[in-house]
Amino acid sequence: LPAQVAFTPYAPEPGSTCRLREYYDQTAQMCCSKCSPGQHAKVFCTKTSDTVCDSCEDSTYTQLWNWVPECLSCGSRCSSDQVETQACTREQNRICTCRPGWYCALSKQEGCRLCAPLRKCRPGFGVARPGTETSDVVCKPCAPGTFSNTTSSTDICRPHQICNVVAIPGNASMDAVCTSTSPTRSMAPGAVHLPQPVSTRSQHTQPTPEPSTAPSTSFLLPMGPSPPAEGSTGD
C-alpha cells in the first residue's frame, strides 16, 4: 500500500523532519505550512488548524517561504546619488546602487547604503587604478616622460609628444611644446579615458587613499540595524 500523505498540521514521526515548505512549530508540536514569498503568518497553526497566511502590506516584503508574523520593511527610497536597480515589491526589497561617477563607500546586504563621488586625479596625477562600484579611484604621480593636465577620475598619464625641436619641455602636468609643425607621438593623440565602472552587485572593500590625490570626502557613519532575518525561512 502507498504511504498516506499527511496534511498539515501533522505530528512528525520521531526523529524525522518536516517536509519542504513546512516548519516544525514548537508550541503546537506539529509540522505546519510556511507562507509563500510575498506573504506572512497571520495566524500560527494549532494542533487542528494550519497556518493562516496574509499578503504583505505596501512597502513590506518576504523573499522566502517563511512563518514570520510580520513582513520586512523595504529599505528607504534611493538617494539622489543612487539609482533604483530593483523596486520594492511584496517579494523583494528595493535595491539602490550608485550612479555613474560614484562608488559604494558603505555597502549593505544587497545594494549600497552610502555612495561617494569617485576621486578625481588633479593635473600631474593620473588614474593608477580605476574606480569600481565598490572602490574609489587610485591616483599616481605621472612618471617622467608622461603627463596629465586634467582633473579627472578616468584620465591616465599620457606620454609627452616627441618633438623634433622642443620649445617648452613637458612636465608632469603639461605636454611638451614643439617648435616644428609636425610633432611625432609615441601614442595616438588625445586623452586616454578609462571606462566608468559598470554597476554590478559586489562586496565593498574599503579603499586605501593615496596621499598624492585631490581631496576626497571621508565618510564615517554608524551602521544602522540591519532588517531582521526572516525566522526559519529556508525551504
Epitope: 514548537q26 508550541t27 503546537a28 503568518a41 497571520k42 495566524v43 500560527f44 494549532t46 494542533k47 487542528t48 488548524s49 493562516v52 508574523p69 510580520e70 531582521p228 525566522g231 526559519s232
Partner: antibody, heavy 119, light 106 residues
Amino acid sequence: QVTLKESGPALVKPTQTLTLTCTFSGFSLSTSGMGVGWIRQPPGKALEWLAHIWWDDDKFYNPSLKSQLTISKDTSKNQVVLTMTNMDPVDTATYYCARITGTRYFDYWGQGTTVTVSS
Amino acid sequence: DVQMTQSPSSLSASVGDRVTITCKASQDINKFIAWYQQKPGKAPKLLIHYTSTLQPGIPSRFSGSGSGRDYTFTISSLQPEDIATYYCLQYGNLWTFGGGTKVEIK
C-alpha cells in the same frame, strides 16, 4: 473595544477546586486566530502563564501545572472557564485572563481577580 | 520548558536617563518576545511584540531589539510615568515570563 473581566471566589480552602470565569467582549472565539489565556501573579512575584484555549478548541497548559488545570470555552456566551484542582496556599495570587492573538502574544488583559487560599 | 532570565531585578535611574533591561532565553525563541509594563494594582500593558514592534499608542522612547536567545528592552529617556515593573514574555515555545524589573526614579 476589547474588554475582559475575571470572576470567581475571593477565598478558597486548601484542597478545594477553584473555578474562574473570564467574560469578554469586543471579539469572538469563533474567529480564526482568537484565543483566551490565564495568567497568575502571586503577591510581589512575577507573572506565570497557566493555560489558554484557541478558537478551534485547541488547548495549552503550563506543563508544571497541567494535572491541576482544565480550560474550556462557551463561544455563545463569550466566556472561558478555568478550573484548578487541589488548591494550596502557594496558589494565592491575582488571576488574570487575557486575549491572545493569532501570532501568540497577549494583547488585552482583564483587571484581575484576587484569590486567597486559606483554611 | 523555556526559561527566561531577566536582569536587573530592579534599577534606579534619573529622569531623562537611558534605561536598558535584558532577557536571556534558555533556547532560541526566534524573536518571539513581548514586553509588558505593570503598575501597582494594575494589569500588565503590552508595549512591544515580536522583539521590536511597538504597539499603537506606545511612546517611541520604548524600543526592543535582539535575536536568538538575547533580547533587550530600552527606555531612551526615562519619564516619571515610566515608573513600573517591566516583564518580558517569550512565546516561541509555549509561554514564559521573565522575573520582572522594577524601575524606580532616583
